[in-house]
C-alpha cells in the first residue's frame, strides 16, 4: 500500500493532533495520520498529528523504529486515536517494523 502513487484528488483523513506542533488544535486533516514517540533527556515525548502531503510522510512512515524514535502511521479517520508508538525492546523483534496500518 505504501508504494501506491498518490491519487489526483487524494482522500483526506481527520487525525488526532497532540503535541507542540498542534498549537491549540486537537485535530488536523491530512493524507496520513501518525503517532510518534521520541526521547528527550530520558523522558518519553508522544506526539500525534497528520501529514498533509503524501510525500511528507512517505519516508517517515517507512523508517524502522530506533532506540530513540518510533513513528506509526495509518490512513483512516481518527485512526491514530488509540495508537501509542513503541520503541523497540532490546533483544526482541519489534512487531511494527513496517509501522503502517490501514483502516
Amino acid at each position: 500500500m505504501e508504494d501506491e502513487k498518490p491519487k489526483v484528488n487524494p482522500k483526506l483523513y481527520m487525525c488526532v493532533c497532540e503535541g507542540l506542533s498542534c498549537g491549540n488544535e486537537d485535530h488536523c486533516e491530512g493524507q496520513q495520520c501518525f503517532s510518534s514517540l521520541s526521547i528527550n533527556d530520558g523522558f518519553h515525548v508522544y506526539q500525534k498529528g497528520c501529514f498533509q502531503v503524501y510525500e511528507q510522510g512517505k519516508m517517515t512512515c517507512k523508517t524502522p523504529p530506533s532506540p530513540g524514535q518510533a513513528v506509526e502511521c495509518c490512513q483512516g479517520d481518527w485512526c491514530n486515536r488509540n495508537i501509542t508508538a513503541q520503541l523497540p525492546t532490546k533483544g526482541k523483534s519489534f512487531p511494527g517494523t513496517q509501522n503502517f496500518h490501514l483502516e
Epitope: E18, S35, L37, I39, D41, G42, F43, H44, Y46, K48, R81, N82, T84
Partner: antibody
Framework: EVQLLESGGGLVQPGGSLRLSCAAS????????MSWVRQAPGKGLEWVSA????????YYADSVKGRFTISRDNSKNTLYLQMNSLRAEDTAVYYC?????????WGQGTLVTVSS | EIVLTQSPGTLSLSPGERATLSCRAS???????LAWYQQKPGQAPRLLIY???SRATGIPDRFSGSGSGTDFTLTISRLEPEDFAVYYC?????????FGQGTKVEIK
C-alpha cells in the same frame, strides 16, 4: 535484567533528614528518567519526584517541594532522594522507579518512619 | 493538578467473572499518557497497561485497557485467583504526575 535496589530508610525524628539511594542495573541508566514514588501505610501510591536522564531537569510533588531534593550520579548508576524537614506524614515505603513516562520497573521499596 | 478518581473503591467478584474498573480524570488526558498498575500486599506495583490500551511485557491478554479524554477503563475478562489485588491508574500527561486512589478487587 533490570534491577532497582533502594536503601537508606529508617526511623527519624520530625524535622530530621534522611538520604535514600537507589542502585540501578540492567539498563543504560543515563538514558532514562527516574522517579521516587511513595506509599503511606495502608494508603495509595503518591508520585514524589522525577529527574531527567542527564539530571538537568527535576520535578516535585507540591507536598515535598522545598524539602526534598532528587539527584543522580550516572557514573555510579545511582538515584538519590535527600529528604529534609521530615514530617509524620512523610512516613511511607519509598520506591524508586524507572520512569521515562509510565513506571515500568520498580524497586522493592525502603521504609521511612518519621516519629518522635 | 490532574485528579484521577477511580471507581468503585472495592469490587467484590468471584473467579471467572469479568471486572470493569473505571478511572476518571478531572481534565482531558491524552491516551498515550495513561497507565494502569496492579499491586498485591507486600509487593511493589507492577505495570499492566500503558498508552491506555497497550499491554506491558508479560501481561496476560485477559487484561485490557480502553478510553480517551477523561474516561478510562481497565477490564479483566475472566478473573483468575492471582488477579485479586489493588489496581491504580496513573497519568503522566501533566506535572505533577498523579495516581488514582485505587480500586481493590476482592474475592466475593
Amino acid at each position: 535484567e533490570v534491577q532497582l535496589l533502594e536503601s537508606g530508610g529508617g526511623l527519624v525524628q520530625p524535622g530530621g533528614s534522611l538520604r535514600l539511594s537507589c542502585a540501578a542495573s540492567g539498563f543504560t541508566f543515563s538514558s532514562y528518567a527516574m522517579s521516587w514514588v511513595r506509599q503511606a501505610p495502608g494508603k495509595g501510591l503518591e508520585w514524589v519526584s522525577a529527574i531527567s536522564g542527564s539530571g538537568g531537569s527535576t520535578y516535585y510533588a507540591d507536598s515535598v517541594k522545598g524539602r526534598f531534593t532528587i539527584s543522580r550520579d550516572n557514573s555510579k548508576n545511582t538515584l538519590y532522594l535527600q529528604m529534609n524537614s521530615l514530617r509524620a506524614e512523610d512516613t511511607a515505603v519509598y520506591y524508586c522507579a524507572k520512569s521515562a513516562s509510565f513506571f515500568d520497573y520498580w524497586g522493592q521499596g525502603t521504609l521511612v518512619t518519621v516519629s518522635s | 493538578e490532574i485528579v484521577l478518581t477511580q471507581s468503585p473503591g472495592t469490587l467484590s467478584l468471584s473467579p471467572g467473572e469479568r471486572a470493569t474498573l473505571s478511572c476518571r480524570a478531572s481534565q482531558s488526558v491524552s491516551s498515550s499518557y495513561l497507565a494502569w498498575y496492579q499491586q498485591k500486599p507486600g509487593q511493589a506495583p507492577r505495570l499492566l497497561i500503558y498508552g491506555a490500551s497497550s499491554r506491558a511485557t508479560g501481561i496476560p491478554d485477559r487484561f485490557s485497557g480502553s478510553g480517551s479524554g477523561t474516561d478510562f477503563t481497565l477490564t479483566i475478562s475472566r478473573l483468575e485467583p492471582e488477579d485479586f489485588a489493588v489496581y491504580y491508574c496513573q497519568q503522566h500527561f501533566r506535572w505533577p504526575w498523579t495516581f488514582g486512589q485505587g480500586t481493590k478487587v476482592e474475592i466475593k
